[in-house]
Interface confidence: medium
């Protein structure tokens, strides 16, 4: 089990680092988006795990962004960001669609309402229960 957990961590960390870089290979990214969406978490250890991902980096004050699957829907009243950015992406996650391209990558500023903690603990708990 410890070996499985280490392997899982390695896969997840690689998925995060390579997020969005290859539009032809999005299965791992979509799976991880789904994990974040379902477990209400963001990143592996912390949301900051996403900050090194080049494709999510903007300029200046927009340098910190995370995938929309990190977004805490229950914590916002901002209907604009919900309707225009978040909900279309999460509806795809909800239906487990497999039709995303790099141009569609949905990212929100880190100062948005995003989940407070990483997914490691939740996934490890799931592994132990299965």
């Amino acid at each position: 089990r410890a070996q499985l957990e280490r392997s899982l961590r390695d896969v997840v960390e690689k998925t995060i680092q390579k997020y969005g870089t290859n539009p032809e290979e999005t299965a791992a990214e979509e799976s991880w988006d789904y994990v974040q969406f379902q477990l209400r978490c963001c990143g592996w250890h912390y949301p900051q795990d996403w900050f090194q991902v080049l494709i999510l980096r903007g300029n200046g004050s927009e340098a910190h962004r995370v995938p929309c699957s990190c977004y805490n829907l229950s914590a916002t009243n901002d209907s604009t960001i919900l309707d225009k950015v978040i909900l279309p992406q999460l509806s795809r996650l909800g239906h487990l669609a497999r039709s995303r391209h790099s141009a569609d990558i949905c990212a929100v500023p880190a100062e948005s309402h995003i989940y407070r903690e990483g997914c490691a603990q939740g996934l490890q708990k799931w592994l132990h229960n299965n």
Partner: antibody, heavy 119, light 108 residues
Framework: EVQLVESGGGLVQPGGSLRLSCAAS????????MNWVRQAPGKGLEWVSI???????DYASWAKGRFTISRDNSKNTLYLQMNSLRAEDTAVYYC?????????????WGQGTLVTVSS | DMTQSPSTLSASVGDRVTITCQAS??????LAWYQQKPGKAPKLLIH???TLASGVPSRFKGSGSGTEFTLTISSLQPDDFATYYC????????????FGGGTKVEIK
């Protein structure tokens, strides 16, 4: 009404142990990150520990190894187990809710419970 | 670490008061301000650097992002004489304290 009530403070000798409790009402501990913060007499606020909704924990570097944060979801109660206590651990200890979204602040706070470490 | 200044501030009713908080790294806007009165628990004033907590008077204003943050009280009231703390909510990993050292606002 959302409320936190601490208990378990008191006088303890150096090297001794104490377990603080924080009873929550009006919300569920299991869906929130919860913190312990302390304040030595006449000093500022000092963060001690956090337990996330998932059960993962973090500690201030000085608290690692001596202090343990935990919770009992069935009792909706947060705990802080303090071992190998020293005189410098004398303080009022507060529990506070943080929520589940990154950037949530501590609100509400309990009234605090005084821990005195002295021989 | 969070560096708060000044540690003590003497002011009169009606004064405009400014307290600053500096983070040792970029904390985006994950900063809160608290007010504490003697013998009482801290009370949340501002979260996410500039969002006023429920029931807090509009004379309190938070600003800043990244590493530099400011709490401004536009017109000091008798009830505002207290100690104010900033706190970063960016990370709890491998740190000594998430709070600044505090600023005591006292009567001049």
């Amino acid at each position: 009404e959302v409320q936190l009530v601490e208990s378990g403070g008191g006088l303890v000798q150096p090297g001794g142990s104490l377990r603080l409790s924080c009873a929550a009402s009006g919300f569920s501990l299991s869906y929130n990150a919860m913190n312990w913060v302390r304040q030595a007499p006449g000093k500022g606020l000092e963060w001690v520990s956090i337990i996330f909704a998932s059960g993962r924990t973090d500690y201030a570097s000085w608290a690692k190894g001596r202090f343990t944060i935990s919770r009992d979801n069935s009792k909706n109660t947060l705990y802080l187990q303090m071992n190998s206590l020293r005189a410098e651990d004398t303080a009022v200890y507060y529990c506070a809710r943080e929520g589940s979204t990154w950037g949530d602040a501590l609100d509400p706070w309990g009234q605090g419970t005084l821990v005195t470490v002295s021989s | 670490d969070m560096t708060q200044s000044p540690s003590t501030l003497s002011a009169s009713v009606g004064d405009r008061v400014t307290i600053t908080c500096q983070a040792s790294q970029n904390i985006i806007d994950y900063l809160a301000w608290y007010q504490q009165k003697p013998g009482k628990a801290p009370k949340l004033l501002i979260h996410k650097a500039s969002t006023l907590a429920s029931g807090v008077p509009s004379r309190f204003k938070g600003s800043g992002s990244g590493t530099e943050f400011t709490l401004t009280i536009s017109s000091l009231q008798p009830d505002d004489f207290a100690t104010y703390y900033c706190q970063q909510g960016y990370s709890n990993s491998n740190i000594d304290n998430t709070f600044g050292g505090g600023t005591k606002v006292e009567i001049k």
